[in-house]
C-alpha cells in the first residue's frame, strides 16, 4: 500500500493531525523534498552573517558574511576575520609578515620573497610585507661588456619560489 | 567520510561549568591535533585551545586560560572542552575542528574540517 505523504510535495509536509494531508509549510519554514513529515525551521543570517538568499518554503536560506569578513565551514557556518594585504590570520588574531615574506591578500599566510639568485636573477623591486619581489635581469647581463641587455623577466607566480 | 559531531552546550548561569564533547569519525584520530574555536553573536572565529595528537601539549587563549581544559580520549576517538567559571562573553557557538598535523600549535591555523556547532548560552 503506497504512503499517502509520497504524494506531498517539497513546500508541504504531511500533517498526521489533518488525515495525512498535505499541508503548505508554515512561515520561516522550509521543505526541500516530497513526503516530508515535518517542515525544518529556516536558517537565520544573524549579526556578523547577512542574507544572500532568502528562505523559501522549498529551500533553506543562504548566508554569507558582512564586509571584513568572509565564509568558512559547509555553508558559510562560520566567518573568519579578514586581515589588511601584509599581514596574516594566526590564531591571535592578525600579525603583520615578517620581514622577508609577503601576503597580497586580505586572508592566507605570509609566503616567503622569490629568490631571483636561484634563478640567476637580479632584484629588480625589493619586496615588501604586502608585494613579492620583482626580478630582473641576471647580473651578467648587466655587465660592462654585455653585448646587449635582455628584458625583464615576467615577475614569477607570487611566492613561488623554485624547487 | 571525515565528521566532527559536538555536544553538550546549551543554557547555563554565569559561574557555572558544562563539559563540550566531539566525536570523531573517518579518520586515525590520534593522528591529528585538534582545536576548539568559537563565534560570540555578531562577532568573528575566536580560538579558543588546540592540543597535540597524543595529548601532551596543549595551548589555550587568553581569554580562557586557567577556566577552560581541553583533553581527549585516543580510545574514545572523542575532544573535550570542560568550561569552567563560565562568564556571559562566554556565550557563542562552540567548534571542533580537525587539524592536518599532529602537532599542536597556538599560531597557524591548520584546519581542514569542522563540526557543525554546538551553542553555549551563558545567562541568568
Known amino acids: 500500500l503506497q504512503d499517502p505523504c509520497s504524494n506531498c510535495p517539497a513546500g508541504t509536509f504531511c500533517d498526521n493531525n489533518r488525515n495525512q494531508i498535505c499541508s503548505p509549510c508554515p512561515p520561516n519554514s522550509f521543505s526541500s523534498a516530497g513526503g516530508q513529515r515535518t517542515c525544518d525551521i529556516c536558517r537565520q543570517c544573524k549579526g556578523v552573517f547577512r542574507t544572500r538568499k532568502e528562505c523559501s518554503s522549498t529551500s533553506n536560506a543562504e548566508c554569507d558574511c558582512t564586509p571584513g569578513f568572509h565564509c568558512l565551514g559547509a555553508g558559510c557556518s562560520m566567518c573568519e576575520q579578514d586581515c589588511k594585504q601584509g599581514q596574516e590570520l594566526t590564531k591571535k588574531g592578525c600579525k603583520d609578515c615578517c620581514f622577508g615574506t609577503f601576503n597580497d591578500q586580505k586572508r592566507g599566510i605570509c609566503r616567503p620573497w622569490t629568490n631571483c639568485s636561484l634563478d640567476g636573477k637580479s632584484v629588480l623591486v625589493n619586496g615588501t610585507k604586502e608585494r613579492d619581489v620583482v626580478c630582473g635581469p641576471s647580473p651578467a647581463d648587466l655587465s660592462p661588456g654585455a653585448s646587449s641587455v635582455t628584458p625583464p623577466a615576467p615577475a614569477r607566480e607570487p611566492g613561488h619560489s623554485p624547487q | 567520510e571525515v565528521q566532527l559531531l559536538e555536544s553538550g552546550g546549551g543554557l547555563i548561569q554565569p559561574g557555572g561549568s558544562l563539559r563540550l564533547s566531539c566525536a570523531a569519525s573517518g579518520f586515525t584520530f590520534s593522528s591529528f591535533a585538534m582545536t576548539w574555536v568559537r563565534q560570540a553573536p555578531g562577532k568573528g572565529l575566536e580560538w579558543v585551545s588546540t592540543?597535540?595528537?597524543?595529548?601532551?601539549?596543549?595551548y589555550y587563549a587568553d581569554s580562557v586560560k586557567g577556566r577552560f581544559t581541553i583533553s581527549r580520549d585516543n580510545s574514545k576517538n572523542t575532544l573535550y572542552l570542560q568550561m569552567n567559571s563560565l562568564r556571559a562573553e562566554d556565550t557563542a557557538v562552540y567548534f571542533c575542528?580537525?587539524?592536518?598535523?599532529?602537532?599542536?600549535?597556538?599560531?597557524?591555523?591548520?584546519?581542514?574540517?569542522w563540526g557543525q556547532g554546538t551553542t553555549v548560552t551563558v545567562s541568568s
Open positions: 592540543i597535540s595528537g597524543s595529548g601532551d601539549n596543549t
Open positions: 575542528a580537525k587539524e592536518d598535523t599532529a602537532v599542536a600549535s597556538d599560531y597557524y591555523y591548520n584546519i581542514d574540517v
